[in-house]
């Protein structure tokens, strides 16, 4: 005859304060004759949690009817869980005896612990923007979870990152724990539309991790490239000069034209377009009057991007004799 086995399937049971905990225990044999009792802890000081035959256990109910003849399920429910209920619970088979029933076999035990879900991860980026090819740090924090075991991963656009450091505090026993992780991310020029994700997995989340995100658009500054060109065609006695400011982020941009070192106050036409990668292009047109007296015109397009030092591009206007003739012909 096969020897009785006491089956307690869960090694760990996470419960929430105020809720009901179910502790499972089944036996594989009806023999030997005798009761199954529940204890918390081991050793001489173990605490009796449930005894069907005697005692008053107002918070404990059985899952099955223990009076049924062939019952092999000795699972119990404990209601209104408090922090004082944590510990390891054992279902123990006793052999009928006199003057006392004799302990025959114990289950492996189920550890009841207070489970608390981690808070939604909060991801914070750097205080100031940084240009591509540089490294920025992101921090992720989540609090209030228990037990201590937790897994944190970082992703950039779905690709897992490896350069990060994580700490869980406190190191000793506690009612609840916090996690803080710092990831180092190298910025790419196309990262305006990129995201970093901090993913936290915990036993209380039942396989559905929590995520916190940060947009790299908050952390990146893509400096513009400038190009100043003279349009081949002229309109009357005016030449059209274009300043193209390409691939910059964020949008914050100040553009000024100078003619021979003098800042021009007059209105200029301009357009702003957004690129697929989230950067911007800005095109500004400047009309220059051409006359016989204007031999050497140097135009400067100066751009101040996102509070950084101004960058500029110069263009020496090429006014051909033919153009001058045309312009004088056009003069009334």
């Amino acid at each position: 005859e096969e020897e009785l086995q006491m089956i307690q399937p869960e090694k760990l049971l996470l419960v929430t304060v105020g809720k009901t905990a179910t502790l499972h225990c089944t036996v594989t044999s009806l023999l030997p004759v005798g009761p199954v009792l529940w204890f918390r802890g081991v050793g001489p000081g173990r605490e009796l949690i449930y005894n069907q035959k005697e005692g008053h256990f107002p918070r404990v109910t059985t899952v099955s009817d223990l009076t049924k003849r062939n019952n092999m399920d000795f699972s119990i429910r404990i209601s209104s869980i408090t922090p004082a209920d944590v510990g390891t619970y054992y279902c123990v088979k006793f052999r009928k005896g006199s003057p006392e029933n004799v302990e025959f076999k114990s289950g492996p035990g189920t550890e009841m612990a207070l489970g608390a879900k981690p808070s939604a991860p909060v991801v914070l980026g750097p205080a100031a923007r940084t240009t591509p090819e540089h490294t920025v740090s992101f921090t992720c924090e989540s609090h209030g979870f228990s037990p201590r075991d937790i897994t944190l991963k970082w992703f950039k656009n779905g690709n897992e990152l490896s350069d990060f450091q994580t700490n869980v505090d406190p190191t000793g026993q506690s009612v609840a724990y916090s996690i803080r992780s710092t990831a180092r991310v190298v910025l790419d020029p196309w990262d305006v539309r990129s995201q970093v994700i901090c993913e936290v997995a915990h036993v209380t989340l039942q396989g559905d991790p929590l995520r916190g995100t940060a947009n790299l658009s908050e952390a990146i500054r893509v400096p513009p490239t400038l190009e100043v060109t003279q349009q081949p065609m002229r309109v009357g006695n005016q030449v059209n000069v274009t300043c193209q400011v390409r691939k910059f982020y964020p949008q914050s941009l100040q553009l000024t034209w100078s003619e021979n070192g003098n800042v021009c106050q007059r209105e200029t036409a301009s357009t702003l377009t957004e690129n697929k990668d989230g950067t911007y292009n800005w095109t500004s047109w400047f009309l220059v009057n051409i006359s016989d007296q204007r031999d050497d015109v140097v135009l400067t397009c100066q751009v101040k991007h996102d509070g950084q030092l101004a960058v500029s591009k110069r263009l020496a206007l090429e006014v051909t004799v033919h153009q001058k003739d045309q312009s004088s012909d056009a003069t009334p």
């Epitope: 050793g43 001489p44 173990r46 005896g97 003057p99 006392e100 004799v102 076999k105």
Partner: antibody, heavy 121, light 107 residues
Framework: QVQLVQSGAEVKKPGASVKVSCKAS????????VHWVRQAPGQGLEWMGR????????NTAQKFQGRVTMTRDTSTSTVYMELSSLRSEDTAVYYC??????????????WGQGTLVTVSS | DIQMTQSPSSLSASVGDRVTITCRAS??????LNWYQQKPGKAPKLLIY???SLESGVPSRFSGSGSGTDFTLTISSLQPEDFATYYC?????????FGPGTKVDIK
């Protein structure tokens, strides 16, 4: 085969303590309660108490409460019985005995060889 | 505590004799009674448990009966190795108690 091997004879002065060991072998130590029974010279058998080797829980005869301490060491499959405040009437052979597996009535199917404790000034 | 008495306290018998030892409890102990045999300088040996069940390895000439307060150990045909002291023990309640013993010697 099941064996209970006890420590050797002891001579103690009144007021002292004695600790008798009982090493079990040949079975799963934690599965059977171990009882202690003593027998004064030329007298009958007297039950002192028992220990559950699995939990360490004990049950002691009222006569010996406060004087008897029963402990176990599962790593060495050994139970111990310590009797304190010894007096001359504690002179006896002390037996450890294994609680049987089959009977409903608490009965002892294997016994140690006995340890003679002599209390004399 | 439950008191156990045995009678006779001693008896002399010959090999082949049928020997009967009685044990009485001071209150009902159902069938929670065991019998032991002890030889000088040796530990007791379990013969009968639960009043009438023969312990494994014990010769069938030993038998037990009774319930409640009155119990009997019978040796159907006494053998030379049976000369010893016999104790009854109750297991109805704590503390476990033994009878004073019955010494069986050679006539």
């Amino acid at each position: 085969q099941v064996q209970l091997v006890q420590s050797g004879a002891e001579v103690k002065k009144p007021g002292a303590s004695v600790k008798v060991s009982c090493k079990a072998s040949g079975y799963t130590f934690t599965r059977n309660y171990v009882h202690w029974v003593r027998q004064a010279p030329g007298q009958g058998l007297e039950w002192m108490g028992r220990i559950n080797p699995n939990s360490g829980g004990t049950n002691t005869a009222q006569k010996f409460q406060g004087r008897v301490t029963m402990t176990r060491d599962t790593s060495t499959s050994t139970v111990y019985m310590e009797l304190s405040s010894l007096r001359s009437e504690d002179t006896a052979v002390y037996y450890c005995a294994r609680l049987g597996d089959v009977a409903v009535a608490a009965s002892f199917d294997y016994w140690g060889q006995g340890t003679l404790v002599t209390v004399s000034s | 505590d439950i008191q156990m008495t045995q009678s006779p306290s001693s008896l002399s018998a010959s090999v082949g004799d049928r020997v009967t030892i009685t044990c009485r409890a001071s209150q009902s102990i159902s069938s929670y009674l065991n019998w032991y045999q002890q030889k000088p300088g040796k530990a007791p040996k379990l013969l009968i448990y639960d009043a009438s069940s023969l312990e494994s390895g014990v010769p069938s000439r030993f038998s037990g009966s009774g319930s409640g307060t009155d119990f009997t150990l019978t040796i159907s045909s006494l053998q030379p190795e049976d000369f010893a002291t016999y104790y009854c023990q109750q297991a109805n309640s704590f503390p476990l108690t033994f009878g004073p013993g019955t010494k069986v010697d050679i006539k």
